[in-house]
Structures are given as structure tokens and as C-alpha cells.
């Protein structure tokens, strides 16, 4: 098992979480990638995923989540805009690799969103949100559900958790319709 550590981000309501997940370019460039939330005692829940196959630097928006997969850099950029207190939780980037279980990327993100506004005079708190007001084009996509009974994830009690990624087969029959909105910067 690999020690999977957490990185904490403390932000205020209305702000933007902006993280980058590094992956092996040769292995996973075109693989479908996802952003998941992990709740205590539950399976990771997929909130947004890239296309299948993943398109290079093509922004995909699901609600307030924007994913951009940069194949040539081996990098998945995840942004959650207009954060709400209820967005607080543990998140992770994963790469779908059926029939294997999803490959988890380091580190998990412990997001803590608090009420209040911490902008400074002259700061542009909403600058990253304004670009998303362009009338979107909507496409329908499928994000696989992670249904292996062995993958129920306990949120770690401390800052680290032992996480293994066995090569067991998973059942991909249950899928969820996700509305993905390409966003053009």
C-alpha cells in the first residue's frame, strides 16, 4: 500500500480552488480522468470527468467544477469556482483504467471553506469566474461509477491514509449521466 497524503486548502466562500494533478503522460494522456469527493465510509463519488478519450486542453464544466486535461504536460487542472461552505471535504483526482480500478493521483485535497470574504483592496476575487459567463455548449457524457465492493473508502482520521490500487475487475454497468459544459477561455 502507498501512503497517500492530504494537502489542505483553506478558502472563503466565493473563492476558487485551483489544483493540478500530475500523471504519467505516456500511460494516461488520453485516459478519462475524474474529480471525486470522498465521504466517511462511502465510496468515492465522481463529481466531474473528462471526455472519453480525454481531449487535450479542452475545458469541461460540470456545475461549478472545471476540468482541463493538458496531455502534453501530463497535467489535469481542476477548478471549483464560487466555493460554498458545504463544498468542504476530501477530494481526489483519479484516472479511469478499466477493467482495473481507478488510479488515484497524489495528493488528496482537504478543502476547508469558511464563511466571509478575505479579498484585499485591489484584488480581483471574481476574475476567474467571469470567463464562465459565455453561453455554453452542452454535451452529454458518461462518468463510470466506482462500484467495486473493495473500494469503500474510509476518510483517513489523520493526515495520511493507506490506499492500495489492486488490479481487481470492476463493474461498469452503473453509470451516471453528467452534463459537461465545454468552457472557452
Amino acid at each position: 500500500a502507498t501512503k497517500l497524503t492530504e494537502e489542505k486548502y483553506e478558502l472563503k466562500e466565493g473563492q476558487t480552488l485551483d489544483v493540478k494533478c500530475d500523471y504519467t503522460l505516456e500511460k494516461f494522456a488520453s485516459s478519462q480522468k475524474a474529480w471525486q469527493i470522498i465521504r466517511d465510509g462511502e465510496m468515492p463519488k465522481t463529481l466531474a470527468c473528462t471526455e472519453r478519450p480525454s481531449k487535450n486542453s479542452h475545458p469541461v464544466q460540470v456545475g461549478r467544477i472545471i476540468l482541463e486535461d493538458y496531455h502534453d504536460h501530463g497535467l489535469l487542472r481542476v477548478r471549483m469556482v464560487n466555493l460554498q461552505v458545504e463544498d468542504s471535504g476530501l477530494y481526489q483526482c483519479v484516472i479511469y483504467q478499466p477493467p482495473k480500478e481507478p488510479h488515484m493521483l497524489f495528493d488528496r485535497i482537504r478543502l476547508v471553506v469558511t464563511k466571509g470574504f478575505s479579498g484585499t483592496p485591489g484584488s480581483n476575487e471574481n476574475s476567474t469566474q467571469n470567463v464562465y459567463k459565455i453561453p455554453p455548449t452542452t454535451t452529454k457524457a458518461l462518468c463510470p461509477l466506482y462500484t467495486s465492493p473493495r473500494t469503500v473508502t474510509q476518510a483517513p482520521p489523520k493526515s495520511t491514509a493507506d490506499v492500495s490500487t489492486p488490479d481487481s475487475e470492476i463493474n461498469l454497468t452503473n453509470v451516471t449521466d453528467i452534463i459537461r459544459v465545454p468552457v472557452f477561455n
Epitope: 502507498t2 501512503k3 497524503t5 494537502e7 486548502y9 483553506e10 478558502l11 472563503k12 473563492q15 476558487t16 485551483d18 489544483v19 493540478k20 494533478c21 500530475d22 500523471y23 504519467t24 503522460l25 505516456e26 500511460k27 493538458y70 504536460h73 501530463g74 497535467l75 487542472r77 497524489f106 495528493d107 485535497i109 478575505s118 480581483n124 476574475s127 476567474t128
Partner: antibody
Framework: EVQLLESGGGLVQPGGSLRLSCAAS????????MSWVRQAPGKGLEWVST????????YYADSVKGRFTISRDNSKNTLDLQMNSLRAEDTAVYYC????????????WGQGTLVTVSS | EIVMTQSPATLSVSPGERATLSCRAS??????LAWYQQKPGQAPRLLIY???TRATGIPDRFSGSGSGTEFTLTISSLQSEDFAVYYC??????????FGQGTKVEIK
């Protein structure tokens, strides 16, 4: 505990070569990008190069592109910087730095190794 | 390339006083900013990342604020061990990742 230990610094003539190494321990080395950051005497910090966890992606500052090569051996938990065609302006303390898992900032640093380029 | 500008270059403060350091980015970087502390003869140490979040083991007298192009590092009550040079760094997306030129906090 994360530990980064640089070696390989020293005095070299302009046009010469040097290879810096960084031995890493205390974390899952192949899961994290690694970087070199330098600091000329009495000056500020300058990012030099970064390599992804798998080694598949490399980045270089314009000032060293074509002369420096970053590499890593994940089986030995080592990071290297091959420096060729060295110039006087490359004189600096070179730090090995671990890149955070979620963004391109540096959450752990080695103590640095001094490279002096002079005739 | 994003240019990071820190001010002032030197800040003279008495122990126990508040210190406010500024960092300005030449273009918006959202919250993609880190602060480092460096003491003479030592390696830099991460203080703050994501503009606000304190790194592990950093005392709560250090706090970060700002977004977009204007950022501030505040040391609420300077201790003797806080006298050092402080650097900001942006990490918006792709390289080069740039540092400010540093602010030296010295004893008044």
C-alpha cells in the same frame, strides 16, 4: 520526515560541466514532481527546472534551456541536474525541492550545494 | 512570464510589532501564490500556499491574504526568529514559475 540532500557542487571553469544529485527520502518519491531552484550570491530565488513524478515531463527556465538536463531515478530515489556549457552567471547555490502534490510550489527543500563558475 | 514584485525591499520592525509584506503579480493568478521564509545560510521554508493556507508547523501569527494580483503576508507579532527574507512565488499553471525579489524583515 522528508529529507533532501544535494551533492556535486564545486568550482568549474566557464564552458565546463557539472552534475548535481539529490538523494530523497521520507516520502513516495515517484509520486511527486521535483525541481531545482537556484540562488546567486546575495540574490533572490530563481526556478531552474522541474521533472514530473514519472519523469515523463520536464520543464526548464529559458536561461538554462539546452544546457541543463534534469532527470530522476525512481528506483534509487535520486534527482539529477546535468549542467553543461556553464557560465559565470550560473554561479549559485542550487537547491533540490519537492513539488507539492497539488500545485507547483515547493513544500520541502534541501540545504543546497554551491556551484561556482570561474576561471 | 509573470513578474512578481515585492514591497518594501526592506522592512524594519521591532519585536512584538506587526509586519505587513506585499506581493504583486503582473497578471491575475487567482490564489496560486506561495510565501517562503529564508534565514541567512539556510534553505527557504514554505510558510503559506494557495495564498491563505499555512503549511504544516507554521505558527498562526503568519497569515496570508489577497487574490488576483495583490497579496499580503502578515506577521501579527514579530518574534526574534521571524527576522529573515520572505519571498512570494506564483504557480498559476505552466512555467516559468517566478519568485518575487524578496523582502528583508530586519530588527528596528
Amino acid at each position: 520526515e522528508v529529507q533532501l540532500l544535494e551533492s556535486g557542487g564545486g568550482l568549474v571553469q566557464p564552458g565546463g560541466s557539472l552534475r548535481l544529485s539529490c538523494a530523497a527520502s521520507g516520502f513516495t518519491f515517484n509520486a511527486y514532481a521535483m525541481s531545482w531552484v537556484r540562488q546567486a550570491p546575495g540574490k533572490g530565488l530563481e526556478w531552474v527546472s522541474t521533472i514530473s513524478g514519472s519523469g515523463s515531463t520536464t520543464y526548464y527556465a529559458d536561461s538554462v534551456k539546452g544546457r541543463f538536463t534534469i532527470s530522476r531515478d525512481n528506483s534509487k530515489n535520486t534527482l539529477d541536474l546535468q549542467m553543461n556549457s556553464l557560465r559565470a552567471e550560473d554561479t549559485a547555490v542550487y537547491y533540490c525541492a519537492k513539488v507539492a502534490g497539488s500545485n507547483f510550489f515547493f513544500d520541502h527543500w534541501g540545504q543546497g550545494t554551491l556551484v561556482t563558475v570561474s576561471s | 512570464e509573470i513578474v512578481m514584485t515585492q514591497s518594501p525591499a526592506t522592512l524594519s520592525v521591532s519585536p512584538g510589532e506587526r509586519a505587513t509584506l506585499s506581493c504583486r503579480a503582473s497578471q491575475s493568478i487567482n490564489h496560486n501564490l506561495a510565501w517562503y521564509q529564508q534565514k541567512p545560510g539556510q534553505a527557504p521554508r514554505l510558510l503559506i500556499y494557495g495564498a491563505y493556507t499555512r503549511a504544516t508547523g507554521i505558527p498562526d501569527r503568519f497569515s496570508g491574504s489577497g487574490s488576483g494580483t495583490e497579496f499580503t503576508l502578515t506577521i501579527s507579532s514579530l518574534q526574534s526568529e521571524d527576522f529573515a527574507v520572505y519571498y512570494c512565488q506564483e504557480f498559476i499553471l505552466f512555467p516559468p514559475w517566478t519568485f518575487g525579489q524578496g523582502t528583508k524583515v530586519e530588527i528596528k
